[in-house]
């Protein structure tokens, strides 16, 4: 309500190599699993660094005044705006993990607010009105979260909270199961 920005800089959330979260485990089944046990390539980081920026979740820092009608905060507050793409960049062998990053289309991740912080601000009003105290909720950090498959678009799940990270030199073992027979479980998989 009446935000006014006058400063803007950005921070990119780019985890260190080897720390990029795998997508959440997907339900595998006989149809999709034709794993050659010894057919693996050496472990690689699932993203090429040159492409990471294209798919990074950015925290844009905005410094603004809080306004409420004619009243304005005595000092500006700094908050984050989440921006950017989330998802794998280049197809490298470890990228599949239990997710299917080799597919042409897959889980849609969005860069959205993760944590919020409350900040008390003092609003100065014109005409000799007494200053007002107001608590505002500001975005403190951003995160990649998935648009869930069978839920409303607004319900987003974390990108890597429960995600299995690749173990160096090892491939995740497949779990053969029927996805269609496990729809109730699938609904909660993300």
């Amino acid at each position: 309500q009446g935000w006014q920005a006058f400063k803007n800089d950005a921070t990119e959330i780019i985890p260190e190599l080897g720390e990029y979260p795998e997508p959440p485990p997907e339900l595998e089944n006989n149809k999709t699993m034709n794993r050659a046990e010894n057919g693996g390539r050496p472990p690689h980081h699932p993203f090429e660094t040159k492409d990471v920026s294209e798919y990074s979740c950015r925290e844009l820092h905005f410094t603004r005044y809080v306004t409420d009608g004619p009243c304005r905060s005595a000092k500006p507050v700094t908050e984050l705006v989440c921006s950017g793409q989330c998802g794998p960049a280049r197809l490298l062998p470890n990228a599949i993990g239990r997710g299917k990053w080799w597919r042409p289309s897959g889980p849609d991740f969005r860069c959205i607010p993760d944590r919020y912080r409350a900040q008390r601000v003092q609003l100065l009003c014109p005409g000799g009105e007494a200053p007002r105290a107001r608590k505002v909720r500001l975005v403190a950090s951003c995160k990649c979260k998935r648009l869930t498959r069978f839920h409303n678009q607004s319900e987003l799940k974390d990108f890597g909270t429960e995600a299995a990270r690749p173990q160096k030199g090892r491939k995740p073992r497949p779990r053969a199961r029927s996805a269609k027979a496990n729809q109730a479980e699938l609904e909660n998989a993300y």
Epitope: T32, P46, Q85, D108, L147
Partner: antibody
Framework: EVQLVESGGGLVQPGRSLRLSCAAS????????LHWVRQAPGKGLEWVSG????????DYADSVKGRFTISRDNAKNSLYLQMNSLRVEDTALYYC????????????WGQGTTVTVSS | QSVLTQPPSASGTPGQRVTISCSGS????????VNWYQQLPGTAPKLLIY???QRPSGVPDRFSGSKSGTSASLAISGLQSEDEADYYC???????????FGGGTKLTVL
């Protein structure tokens, strides 16, 4: 130049088999996941099957499951589609396509090979 | 019938902006990324948009993609005669466990 060239198409009777090949050049073959997509005459695109870099993950469309087998030979830079128990409705132009960007669409396509199933 | 629904045809005059829609469900567009392909007459398809709104190198910025809920759109601004083609949307479907295409939209430049 990145290139995919399909071959092996032809006229075949229902119930018979055919094997399609796709030869790749101009790029590092095993950096790409590969797929077969078909297009019946005058119709839209239909994804048939896909295979990951080393053939360790495979997917099929329900319409071909149990009849078609996708495979690849990275030493020969080749992708294959073994088509058994062919049906009239399998008649189409079969494209070989690839992607080397996770969830990034099929960014490399061949020109296609025609399969006609008719008695 | 295709899993993803597109209008069979669309048209516009040179310089105009045209939008092609693609409607799906929560198991495909709702939770997965959307790609768009252009197929010029007599040629193989070409990737136009990936991951909802990303353009591969070489694709003019006149082409843009967007997604909201279980629908996606392809917008072409500054329409040119060479844009006359069939356009397909596509996304992974988690129930069918397949990469599904829309039925295609034939774009005519008048």
């Amino acid at each position: 130049e990145v290139q995919l060239v399909e071959s092996g198409g032809g006229l075949v009777q229902p119930g018979r088999s055919l094997r399609l090949s796709c030869a790749a050049s101009g790029f590092t073959f095993d950096d790409y996941a590969l797929h077969w997509v078909r297009q019946a005459p005058g119709k839209g695109l239909e994804w048939v099957s896909g295979i990951s870099w080393h053939g360790d993950f495979i997917d099929y469309a329900d319409s071909v499951k149990g009849r078609f087998t996708i495979s690849r030979d990275n030493a020969k830079n080749s992708l294959y589609l073994q088509m058994n128990s062919l049906r009239v409705e399998d008649t189409a132009l079969y494209y070989c396509a690839g992607n080397n960007r996770g969830y990034g669409g099929l960014d490399v396509w061949g020109q296609g090979t025609t399969v006609t199933v008719s008695s | 019938q295709s899993v993803l629904t597109q209008p069979p045809s669309a048209s516009g005059t040179p310089g105009q902006r045209v939008t092609i829609s693609c409607s799906g469900s929560s198991s495909n567009i709702g939770g997965n990324t959307v790609n768009w392909y252009q197929q010029l007459p007599g040629t193989a398809p070409k990737l136009l948009i990936y991951s909802n709104n990303q353009r591969p190198s070489g694709v003019p910025d006149r082409f843009s993609g967007s997604k909201s809920g279980t629908s996606a759109s392809l917008a072409i601004s500054g329409l040119q005669s060479e844009d006359e083609a069939d356009y397909y949307c596509a996304a992974w479907d988690d129930i069918l466990e397949s990469y599904v295409f829309g039925g295609g939209t034939k774009l005519t430049v008048l």
